[in-house]
Amino acid sequence: CEEPPTFEAMELIGKPKPYYEIGERVDYKCKKGYFYIPPLATHTICDRNHTWLPVSDDACYRETCPYIRDPLNGQAVPANGTYEFGYQMHFICNEGYYLIGEEILYCELKGSVAIWSGKPPICEKVLCTPPPKIKNGKHTFSEVEVFEYLDAVTYSCDPAPGPDPFSLIGESTIYCGDNSVWSRAAPECKVVKCRFPVVENGKQISGFGKKFYYKATVMFECDKGFYLDGSDTIVCDSNSTWDPPVPKCLKVLPPSSTKPPALSHSVSTSSTTKSPASSASGPRPTYKPPVSNYPGYPKPEEGILDSLD
């Protein structure tokens, strides 16, 4: 027989030889970190077929780390369901508790003994410090100094000193969450007021109001003979601007009565666009100018469409 088989859990006793005679026996022992549990054989014999009789390392068991109990208000979960060396122990805390210490311990071999890589962690109750105070507003339970998991506070805005109220920007309620962190940033209290939305050649059809505060929503339609350029619905956003911007009502182009001449590559043409009669300050551009980014009223349309009046 040639060299005897090798195994993960056991090793040959003595040095292997290049060849073995029929009937010759070799013995194995459990490797370091494994221990023998009878009755399975740990030897094999070279038989008449010049092959080794079947043998396995099933009798050698991995050393195991000491049993770890579940931490209070948590669980110790062995990876692969075993405490054997080379494997991990995962620790998780119940809802409302957080882990102090290592989330994973490793079962390691020190000499011939399997021991855990560190101390088991503990599960501590999630507690939050008081949530942030906000300018121009307050929150419920302002006298409480320590908040437990899922305790919630609700913010509200103070009465405003001027004619316009403070608006609450963000979520009014936040709660004490995992890792002792509040579920989201505190909201903000500030005056949000959008300008009166003027649409020339159109009108507002819904969302009427004295003033337009945060989240006010307005809808428009254009007069007959005009079409809407932009969104028919706009909302007052937290920056006191309309989102999307206030639309425009542009003149519907009349149907073309004459077919324009076809241009060949060799023909040079110069086109002139008549400036609208309404232009009181010199010729207007025949392109559509960029929309002003000012959060106010729209300017009258200064585009080529107007030049067809």
């Epitope: 007021k193 300008r195 009166f196 003027v198 009427f208 004295k210 002003s292 009223y297 729209p298």
Partner: antibody, heavy 118, light 107 residues
Framework: QVQLKESGPGLVAPSQNLSITCTVS????????ISWIRQPPGKGLEWLGV???????NYNSAFMSRLSISKDNSKSQVFLKMNSLQTDDTAIYYC????????????WGQGTLVTVSA | DIQMTQTPSSLSASLGDRVTISCSAS??????LNWYQQKPDGTVKLLIY???SLHSGVPSRFSGSGSGTDYSLTISNLEPEDIATYYC?????????FGGGTKLAIK
């Protein structure tokens, strides 16, 4: 405090052009819109046009072809120009500041009388 | 354009009277209506905005009401300084337009 003061030529010959300057104080033209409103003798008020904080304008369509409103923010001045005046353009011309972003005419100048006559 | 019609065009009342001026729009204006006072010397003041909101510094004897196309200004207890011409103004649609005015005199 908020003040608006119009200064005009007083007398304009028919078919000539009109220029009026409105000088404001107590607020910035970058923050408030200005409208022009006129009142013919013994008659009612008539809105001519507006210049927004960003310099954009809207005009009463009845005057669109001969009216122009502009401004110089740094000098706190708003300008009204009207072409081809006729006798029925005789009126007191008021420069007016709107309320905070809303078309409520909250502050009025004292007005300047423009007489169109040969 | 939206036409604004004021009635009456003039009226006389005694001091202490309750006076009502009406303003009618040629189409619905959704409360987008203001009232102004013009004194005999030509000075103009905003009295009421958005149909019924009193502008700062305006005495509480002035009030406004209405909806749709019909609106009114009421002076509950006429004072000598209320002698003036009153104008309504719509702002739902450009061009912004005024009523013809109501001239108020003392009997």
């Amino acid at each position: 405090q908020v003040q608006l003061k119009e200064s005009g030529p007083g007398l304009v010959a028919p078919s000539q052009n009109l220029s009026i300057t409105c000088t404001v104080s107590g607020f910035s033209l970058t923050s408030y819109d200005i409208s022009w409103i006129r009142q013919p003798p013994g008659k009612g008020l008539e809105w001519l046009g507006v210049i927004w904080t960003d310099g954009g304008t809207n005009y009463n369509s009845a005057f669109m072809s001969r009216l122009s409103i502009s401004k110089d923010n740094s000098k706190s001045q708003v300008f009204l120009k009207m072409n081809s005046l006729q006798t029925d353009d005789t009126a007191i011309y008021y420069c007016v500041r709107v309320y905070d972003g809303y078309p409520w005419f909250a502050y009025w100048g004292q007005g300047t009388l423009v007489t169109v006559s040969a | 354009d939206i036409q604004m019609t004021q009635t009456p065009s003039s009226l006389s009342a005694s001091l202490g009277d309750r006076v009502t001026i009406s303003c009618s729009a040629s189409q619905g204006i959704s409360n987008y209506l203001n009232w102004y006072q013009q004194k005999p010397d030509g000075t103009v003041k905003l009295l009421i905005y958005y149909t019924s909101s009193l502008h700062s510094g305006v005495p509480s004897r002035f009030s406004g009401s209405g909806s749709g196309t019909d609106y009114s200004l009421t002076i509950s207890n006429l004072e000598p300084e209320d002698i003036a011409t009153y104008y309504c103004q719509q702002y739902i649609k450009l061009p912004w337009t005024f009523g013809g005015g109501t001239k108020l005199a003392i009997k």
